[in-house]
Interface confidence: low
Amino acid sequence: MRTEAQVPALQPPEPGLEGAMGHRTLVLPWVLLTLCVTAGTPEVWVQVRMEATELSSFTIRCGFLGSGSISLVTVSWGGPNGAGGTTLAVLHPERGIRQWAPARQARWETQSSISLILEGSGASSPCANTTFCCKFASFPEGSWEACGSLPPSSDPGLSAPPTPAPILRADLAGILGVSGVLLFGCVYLLHLLRRHKHRPAPRLQPSRTSPQAPRARAWAPSQASQAALHVPYATINTSCRPATLDTAHPHGGPSWWASLPTHAAHRPQGPAAWASTPIPARGSFVSVENGLYAQAGERPPHTGPGLTLFPDPRGPRAMEGPLGVR
């Protein structure tokens, strides 16, 4: 069921009222402020590292900067999962981890971050500018995905290598609509506050009714409407396509991290230089009830859920082998 922030109907202030800020108009700034504060967009950061000593070995680390509880993490390469990318690992906080070669080890690092080691040798390893994507399904934020790759540079001294301009897809009209309303609201709130700053302090008029303070609530589409959703994502263009992964040669670059997207304050401390593209990962509010874990992304008509996990009663522990078979 879709639930939205319940904002009381606001009538224009009566002419002649000093300050034009009756109790009803006072509600608006607080509602907008609540929306602005609670609508802080979660972010996903992705880091990709190639070991200098082991050029065919990649480490991908992903984290979720949000307050919700993570219900599933999907790591893919060659593009976002559901848009041509191939799944490398799926991590479920309770049912365990399933990974496919060339994933060597997927594991939870913290409650909101994971790491994945990819292994290959020579012609079988992924090429250096392969795109790796991480998608976090969380409640109530929904599904958020970001991608990163090793920038195509082999200069060991480069501390902040240039990253290609990300492509931002925003197919989800609902999210855009809500975002637009929130953005407009925040701007309007600032405008109101600025106007209010230059006016005498208003007198609060006693009201006969004291309506409950509105609560901003996240909305989640029902299962029935999921199929119509599209997951927006931020991704980096790469010249290495999934189809060529089997023959691509590894990039002989240094040991370093490429990060996207993140903020300096939230960056986990990596061992080397950082590259950052401060583009927040976009997401969709996707219901994850009853294992509808696959994103509602662009897919051929014959695709759907079906990400499979290894059920492990012991919880989130990495298991051996591409299918998590001990």
């Epitope: 848009a83 990318g85 079988s124 078979v325």
Partner: antibody, heavy 122, light 107 residues
Framework: EVQVQQSGPELVKPGASVKISCKAS????????MHWVKQSHGKSLEWIGY????????GYNQNFKSKATLTVDISSSTAYMELRSLTLEDSAVYLC???????????????WGQGTLVTVSA | DIQMTQSPASLSVSVGETVTITCRAS??????LAWYHQKQGKSPHLLVY???NLADGVPSRFSGSGSGTQYSLKINSLQSEDFGDYYC?????????FGGGTKLEIK
Amino acid sequence: EVQVQQSGPELVKPGASVKISCKASGYTFTKSNMHWVKQSHGKSLEWIGYIYPYNGGTGYNQNFKSKATLTVDISSSTAYMELRSLTLEDSAVYLCAREADYYGNRGQFDYWGQGTLVTVSA
Amino acid sequence: DIQMTQSPASLSVSVGETVTITCRASDNIFSNLAWYHQKQGKSPHLLVYGATNLADGVPSRFSGSGSGTQYSLKINSLQSEDFGDYYCQHFWGTPYTFGGGTKLEIK
């Protein structure tokens, strides 16, 4: 066009071993798991295990761990299953099947070989 | 291991009728389920995956439904080529297991 072609029928003695093959074509062999399934006469299907040609990674049903060994030859895009210490109960049709990867949706078997009949008889 | 219980074991119906085959998993498999059709002497053929998604080339008279532990395959207006054995299979982690099968016979 994706095709999965299996080797012909085998008649073997109890205690012996047999190696059957599954040749794939029409797709990138290294990118999809290849699974093996047993079907005894008039019975249901039993999953034996899989191999990932990319790096030879395998996973087995515990019931077949001591019975089957899965290997691949990437140069010929062929998967193999060796069955050892054969008994009469191992007489069955053995099928190989490619695991699909529909944009991240994996697990289902979308292309199957025609099956290899293994008969164990003294 | 997750066990798959398929019912009925056999079914005798006429062309044009509608049938429903059910599959119950011993644990939640989160829609990680496929349905296959197998004709005598042939290998299985994928019909449905992800519990509800029709595989390429499968006629629309087939439909899959269900979630959690209960799943079903419905065949509307049965055609002569639909007769044979039907199997469900879970792929929620290994070992993958199949249902016992449903034999669909012409009445």
